[in-house]
């Protein structure tokens, strides 16, 4: 198996551009997490779907932020305008 | 039915500590992110705080960072907002409401601080 | 901090009238939320994301725009709808109002 796999490895952008992440869960895990890392806040939840229903995005409560989860095996991570402050690692998980 | 609860407000002296709780009920608390707001006397809303549902996203007006901390309690079903060092320009009625619909979907009736000697 | 203006700040107008309040961000925003509040009560959201009416919401009101510059509309005033209204942001933090626009019986 390989795991979960998640794309873009590295993103640059400028402030103001929109950044899509997307990540592909293991195959037959129903509940897939996004997450944010940063030195400051430490790790943070986002969001996690259940069976591709968003259950709890209050862990993004800025409207930049937006998640889709639109199939069992993709989810997106959108950010639009994004802010230096947005700088971080996102690693996206899944379990059954 | 979604009821708030606010409590904890009274008078206190300017340097003076209040801790505000918020009590919850006719939801799943633990699923929700939830606000601070307040209001003086003859003004407008101003946002205080937000925690998410897990306590691991906290956001603070730039003013109040180190002066107030806001926290909660989901086996209580408690939202918290511990105010230190107390100024004159706090006074007002501070309202917790639930984060919804990507705002602020209800809200509680409010509990009244007043900072004053 | 993204600034929110209302305009007016002040609004007089009769039962049956169409009224129409701004909201101007500093910054462009992604949705802006309106709020319904009376004297001495909390807070009521209206309208979520722009144009999305809150449940229990009466379709008088409406809610439009992007960018920096979104409307709350009323078609019709009824007794009811006099009282102040907020816009607020969450676009980024902090989450700003706007000051505020009381409605008045003329």
């Known amino acids: 198996d390989a795991g979960v796999i998640q794309s873009p490895r590295h993103e640059v952008t400028e402030m103001g551009q929109e950044v899509t992440l997307r990540c592909k869960p293991i195959s037959g895990h129903n509940s897939l997490f996004w997450y944010r890392q940063t030195m400051m806040r430490g790790l943070e939840l986002l969001i996690y779907f259940n069976n591709n229903v968003p259950i709890d995005d209050s862990g993004m409560p800025e409207d930049r932020f937006s998640a889709k989860m639109p199939n069992a095996s993709f989810s997106t991570l959108k950010i639009q305008p994004s802010e230096p402050r947005d700088s971080a690692v996102y690693f996206c998980a899944s379990s059954l | 039915e979604v009821q708030l609860v606010e409590s904890g407000g009274g008078l206190v002296q300017p340097g003076g500590s209040l801790r505000l709780s918020c009590a919850a009920s006719?939801?799943?608390?633990?699923?929700?992110?939830m606000h601070w707001v307040r209001q003086a006397p003859g003004k407008g809303l101003e946002w205080v705080s937000y925690?998410?549902?897990?306590?691991?996203?906290?956001y603070y007006a730039d003013t109040l960072k180190g002066r107030f901390t806001i926290s909660r309690d989901n086996s209580k079903n408690t939202l918290y907002l511990q105010m230190n060092s107390l100024r004159a320009e706090d006074t007002a009625v501070y309202y917790c409401?639930?984060?919804?619909?990507?705002?602020?979907?209800?809200w509680g009736q409010g509990t009244t601080v007043t900072v004053s000697s | 901090d993204n600034q929110l203006t209302q305009s007016p700040s002040f609004l007089s107008a009769s039962v049956g009238d169409r009224v129409t309040i701004t909201c101007r961000a500093s910054?462009?925003?992604?949705?802006i939320y309106w709020y319904q509040q009376k004297p001495g009560k909390a807070p009521k959201l209206l309208i979520y994301?722009?144009?999305n009416l809150a449940p229990g919401v009466p379709s008088r009101f409406s809610g439009s725009g992007s960018g920096n510059e979104y409307t709350l509309t009323i078609s019709s005033l009824q007794p009811e709808d006099f009282a102040t209204y907020y816009c607020?942001?969450?676009?980024?933090?902090?989450?700003?109002f706007g000051q505020g626009t009381k409605l008045e019986i003329k």
């Open positions: 409401a639930r984060r919804g619909e990507g705002a602020m979907d209800y």
């Open positions: 006719g939801f799943t608390f633990s699923n929700f992110g």
């Open positions: 925690i998410s549902s897990g306590s691991r996203t906290i």
């Open positions: 910054s462009s925003v992604n949705y």
């Open positions: 994301y722009t144009s």
């Open positions: 607020q942001q969450f676009t980024s933090s902090p989450f700003t």
